[in-house]
Amino acid sequence: HTAAQDNCTCPTNKMTVCSPDGPGGRCQCRALGSGMAVDCSTLTSKCLLLKARMSAPKNARTLVRPSEHALVDNDGLYDPDCDPEGRFKARQCNQTSVCWCVNSVGVRRTDKGDLSLRCDELVRTHHILIDLRHRPTAGAFNHSDLDAELRRLFRERYRLHPKFVAAVHYEQPTIQIELRQNTSQKAAGDVDIGDAAYYFERDIKGESLFQGRGGLDLRVRGEPLQVERTLIYYLDEIPPKFSMKRLT
Amino acid sequence: HTAAQDNCTCPTNKMTVCSPDGPGGRCQCRALGSGMAVDCSTLTSKCLLLKARMSAPKNARTLVRPSEHALVDNDGLYDPDCDPEGRFKARQCNQTSVCWCVNSVGVRRTDKGDLSLRCDELVRTHHILIDLRHRPTAGAFNHSDLDAELRRLFRERYRLHPKFVAAVHYEQPTIQIELRQNTSQKAAGDVDIGDAAYYFERDIKGESLFQGRGGLDLRVRGEPLQVERTLIYYLDEIPPKFSMKRLT
């Protein structure tokens, strides 16, 4: 697996441990948390990244650790089970034997149940809508410049084939990026739209997953584009199954 | 209720309609959504603000409207029921007769049920932990300067009495602001910690609720402090009641 030879690091994933113990003394990198070997010439799967994130040592000793009774609106962080290819297993369970089904981006798509819950297949998220709001600027960005810049970003930084960026919509200050990728369209070696969206989300939050590439610096004709709010919507090939109770 | 007399606007709440029809032709402002009169010399309650937010016309016509099957991690936005004082009613229900109990900041604190669900009292959130991560800077901020600046901000911008800012913790790049306010401590006219935290949260997101006061501009000894991630934990006087299924 390609990794920076001389100093043996993984350019596409800083949440790795690398050593020159691959075939012929080649640099090999393993994801934290799972210990799985990763290909450093492309993005690491979201499942392995989440697992690494949950395994990272929590240092902040002098800070307050919220009580177990604290309420917070944050459903998306958990320690996932990944399959041998690094994809999310269709069924995820926690330590207290509560289980639920997820889609290919690891987002829950059923009510929670017990160990008897069955998730027959990993349902593919084939359409991702990234909804951003940018900070105020002197004027609106030029739509076609913005479109070109975001397509370039997804191609260069996240290695996502341009055909998977279906559209870029803009109505100041809202930008929407539509990623589409059916099971049939995704060829071997293609970056998954879910992984590209996750890297982008972490970049926007200033939590870049890349090693030594600096943070995301988004500019349209030299003008910085600073994002102040992000919402990501995931659409699955098969609609999710929730009871009425979810519909608030 | 105090409002800017001559141009009749509400400095503390832009989600209002104001007209000079108060006693003696004084400017009176009513919250959008509820039509309730608000006091423009202090913060408007979070319940009325959420109600106004949900009633605001959605314009963005050319943008994609996510399908009803789209998954998004965002549980905190709903159209609430507020009491005559503008506080959250203890029980909230949606159009499909799904009900749940909330705390004084409007965050769900029980599993969802049906119309038979009882919420005996509005449980007070007496401790709020605001967990921020700031953008990288040349060096760490001086802790006491940061502490003083955040206390000043809460006092000046949100009119929160300094005694309710219990502590400011800092371990670069994480900042934690602890707000504490028991039922017994809160006197008439005191700003509620939940309202102050909500205004702060909206300010951080670049969605200031103030009229004519500019966005939030946070500085420590002149150095801009830019927040890139916020998590808010709410602790209630009585712990929340969730079934085991919540514990993921």
Epitope: A138 | R152, L153, E156, G215, D217, R219
Partner: antibody
Framework: QIQLVQSGPELKKPGETVKISCKAS????????MNWVKQAPGKGLKWMGW????????TYAEEFKGRFAFSLETSASTAYLQINNLKKEDTATYFC??????????????WGAGTTVTVSS | DIVMTQSHKFMSTSVGDRVSITCKAS??????VAWYQQKPGQSPKVLIY???YRYTGVPDRFTGSGSGTDFTFTISRVQAEDLAVYYC?????????FGAGTKLELK
Amino acid sequence: QIQLVQSGPELKKPGETVKISCKASGYTFTNYGMNWVKQAPGKGLKWMGWINTKTGEPTYAEEFKGRFAFSLETSASTAYLQINNLKKEDTATYFCGRGGYGSSYWYFDVWGAGTTVTVSS
Amino acid sequence: DIVMTQSHKFMSTSVGDRVSITCKASQDVSIAVAWYQQKPGQSPKVLIYSASYRYTGVPDRFTGSGSGTDFTFTISRVQAEDLAVYYCQQHYITPLTFGAGTKLELK
């Protein structure tokens, strides 16, 4: 050190135009807004408005809408105040003042020395 | 617009005296009030912001207090170099407004 250097005094006739400059040094220009304050001879201070140095967006106080224009040359860390169709009542000292982007910092911690504009026929 | 009223146009004092200047806002401005000192032929200089916060390098004989609509600026022991005009300013909401000024002079 941090300073705002303003252009020199101006003597103009009614109906003419004047453009005053305010050059900032010693700090990141775009980290602060630039305010303009008028002081007529023997009178108090009057806020004219401010310009957002990040976006170039000006905000004018009601009294100064129309003939007054704020502008920037960001690459030169310079703000400008232009007054068109000068009137006798525009005779005053004009100060630029550094301030923040929100009300918590809408006081002026650094001031220029002032530019005196005299309008006389 | 918010009107800032400084009740005294002039105040007479002696070196070593304690002097207080008041400023009243026409509506509640939280604690968003600054105080400036201006000497003849000079630009104003900020002394206090947010009602009671002393600006960097300002001597501790200068203090401020108040909230809502009533504000006070105090010099605990007047020195000869303190003779100047003092202005209050609300930094709560635009348009930003100043008081008319209070001139501190020797008795």
